[in-house]
Interface confidence: low
Amino acid sequence: AITEAREEAKPYPLFPGPFPGSLQTDHTPLLSLPHASGYQPALMFSPTQPGRPHTGNVAIPQVTSVESKPLPPLAFKHTVGHIILSEHKGVKFNCSISVPNIYQDTTISWWKDGKELLGAHHAITQFYPDDEVTAIIASFSITSVQRSDNGSYICKMKINNEEIVSDPIYIEVQGLPHFTKQPESMNVTRNTAFNLTCQAVGPPEPVNIFWVQNSSRVNEQPEKSPSVLTVPGLTEMAVFSCEAHNDKGLTVSKGVQINIKAIPSPPTEVSIRNSTAHSILISWVPGFDGYSPFRNCSIQVKEADPLSNGSVMIFNTSALPHLYQIKQLQALANYSIGVSCMNEIGWSAVSPWILASTTEGAPSVAPLNVTVFLNESSDNVDIRWMKPPTKQQDGELVGYRISHVWQSAGISKELLEEVGQNGSRARISVQVHNATCTVRIAAVTRGGVGPFSDPVKIFIPAHGWVDYAPSSTPAPGNADPVLII
C-alpha cells in the first residue's frame, strides 16, 4: 500500500495522476491533502452515492485509445444535494469523479456562491488509482458551522483546459433567531405614543416575536417578524426587550431604556469668570438635561442694592458653551445672578443666586459748565466746572485732568495739569500773551480718564489790557467760543 503523502503548505496543488508504468492495483489513496485541524466533524455525509454519472456539465475528451474507441464523457457523480444542520455543528461533504489514467494533470477546487474558496485548509482531496481510472474524492469540512456558511458549494475540475463542474450542494445552517433590527433606547414625552421595532430572521422560519416590558410580556399572542410595538404612552421610565422564537429556540434582544422627558435640573456651579466696569462674564455647569437636549438658557440679573427697584434684567443665550457675557451693567455695582435653562419640556428652576460686582470704570461723561476767565492782575487763567453726575462717574472721583493749549503766531503747545478731586476750580499761569488758550477738562477715577469736555477758548491779550468777562462751555451746536478782551 502507498503511504499517505501530506502537503501542508499547499491546499490546492496540481494533483498528479499515477505515472504510466506505475499503475496501482490497490485502493489506498495515492495522495491525500490534509484537513488542517484533524477535527472529526459531528455530521458527516457519505462520499459518493453509487449510480450513473449525471449528464450536466461534462467534458468529452479528445483523446482516443489504441483501439481508437472514444473515451466516455467525464462528469462528477451525483451526491447529496441539500444539507440542513444546526449552527455550531460540524459537517463534511464531498464530490467525486473517476478520471481515466490517461489524464495525468488535473486540478480540483471548491467554490461557494460563485467565489473560489481560497486558502481553505479544511478541503481535502484523495486519489484512488486503479488500472484504468483514478477515482478522485474531494471533501470539504467545516468544524463549527455559522450562518455565514450558508450557500451553494460546487467542485470544479480543470482537465486538459476543459472545466467540469459538479452539481451544487446546498448548505442550510439553522439556528436561533438572529436579530436584524432591535429596539432602540428612546427619550419620550410623558403620555405620548411611540413605536418600537424588532426584526429577527432564521432559518428556520417563521420567527415569532414577543414583547417584554419591565420583565413582563406585553403580547400574549406572538407576532410574525418584523413586529412594531405601539406603546400608547408612559408615565415613568421602562425597559423594553423583544423575544424572537423559532423551532430552534428563542433569542432575547438587548433591553432598552425608555426615559420620560422632564424639565431639566437647575444649572449648578454658576461662577464669575471676569468682571469689568460694565460687564460680567459668567459660566455654569448644566444640570441633568431631563432626557431632552437643552435649547437655550436665560440669565437673570437683579441689582443687589437694597435701594434699587428690584427689577430683573433677562438675557437669553444658547445652551452652549455654558458661558455668557452680561453687558450694559453699571460700574461699581452689586448684582445677583441666576441661570435657568430649558429643553422642549420647559424651563428649569433658577440656579442658586450668586453675587457679583462690576469694577470701577473711567467716567462716561465730561465735567459740565466749564468756564474760563483771565485774571490779569495775577497773570492767571481761572477755570471752573461742575463735576459729572454721580451715576456717570463710574467710580470714585480721584481728580481731574486739565488740558490747556496755547496758540500764537503758528506756535502751539499743550500742557496737562492734574487736580485733586475736592475742587471744582483751578488756576493756571498764563504761558503766552497775545495768544489763544484752549481749555478741556476730563474727570479721573481709578478706572481711568473720562472724556474731555468741549474746548473753551480764551484770548490772552498783550500786557496792559483790561480783564473783561469769562468764557464758558458753549450751548450744544454753537461754534467754539472765543472771547477777545
Epitope: G255, F288, D289, Y291, P321
Partner: antibody
Framework: QVQLVQSGSELKKPGASVKVSCKAS????????MNWVRQAPGQGLEWMGW????????TYAQGFTGRFVFSLDTSVSTAYLQISSLKAEDTAVYYC?????????????WGQGTLVTVSS | DIQMTQSPSSLSASVGDRVTITCKAS??????VAWYQQKPGKAPKRLIY???NRHTGVPSRFSGSGSGTEFTLTISNLQPEDFATYYC?????????FGGGTKVEIK
Amino acid sequence: QVQLVQSGSELKKPGASVKVSCKASGYTFTNHGMNWVRQAPGQGLEWMGWINTYTGEPTYAQGFTGRFVFSLDTSVSTAYLQISSLKAEDTAVYYCARKGVTAARYFDYWGQGTLVTVSS
Amino acid sequence: DIQMTQSPSSLSASVGDRVTITCKASQNVRTAVAWYQQKPGKAPKRLIYLASNRHTGVPSRFSGSGSGTEFTLTISNLQPEDFATYYCLQHWNYPLTFGGGTKVEIK
C-alpha cells in the same frame, strides 16, 4: 463632595479570584453609570466596560468577557469588579470611574485605583 | 473599534512654555473627546470634556479644541504642577478608547 474609594492592593496566585470594590459617596449612586479602567504597569489606560447602576446591566469591552464580572450593591452604593482564573497578565491597577452625565460617556471622578498583582 | 492616535508620545518643555498635544480618531467622533491628566502613582484627573469644555476647577491655561477626527489639548503657560502624562478618550462609540498618552517632562 463626590468620592470613589476603592479597596486595597491585592496579591494573588495564578488561578485565584479577586473582587475589587468601589464605594461611592457624595452623590446619588444610581444616577451615574460606573466604568472600569485597567492600567498595566508602565502602560496606558484601557477601558474594560461599564455597568448601569440603575438596571445593573453590564457592558464589557472585547477581551473582558468571561473572566471579568461587574456587579453592584446599591444598598451600600458600591460597584464591584470580580476577576476569576487570574493570570500574570492581569497584573495592573484597576480604576473605577464615574460617568460624568447621564447621557454622555466620559468620566468625571475616578477612584484612587487598586493594584492587583498576580504572581506565583 | 475607533483608534485614538495621540502625539507626541513624550515631550520636554520649560515652565512658561505653550504645549500642544493632538489626538486623531480613526472615525468621526463628533466632539465626543475628553482629556485627562495623570501623575505617577495617582488616578487620572479630569480636564476637558466634549472636546473644549473645561471641568470646574481646571485652570484656564488648559484648553481643548477640535471636532470630527482631530483634537488638540493646549497648555498655554506651563506650570511646575503640569508635568504629567495626558490622555485623550473618545466617548462617541463603544468600546470607549484612550489615546496612548503623552508624557510632558521638564526640559
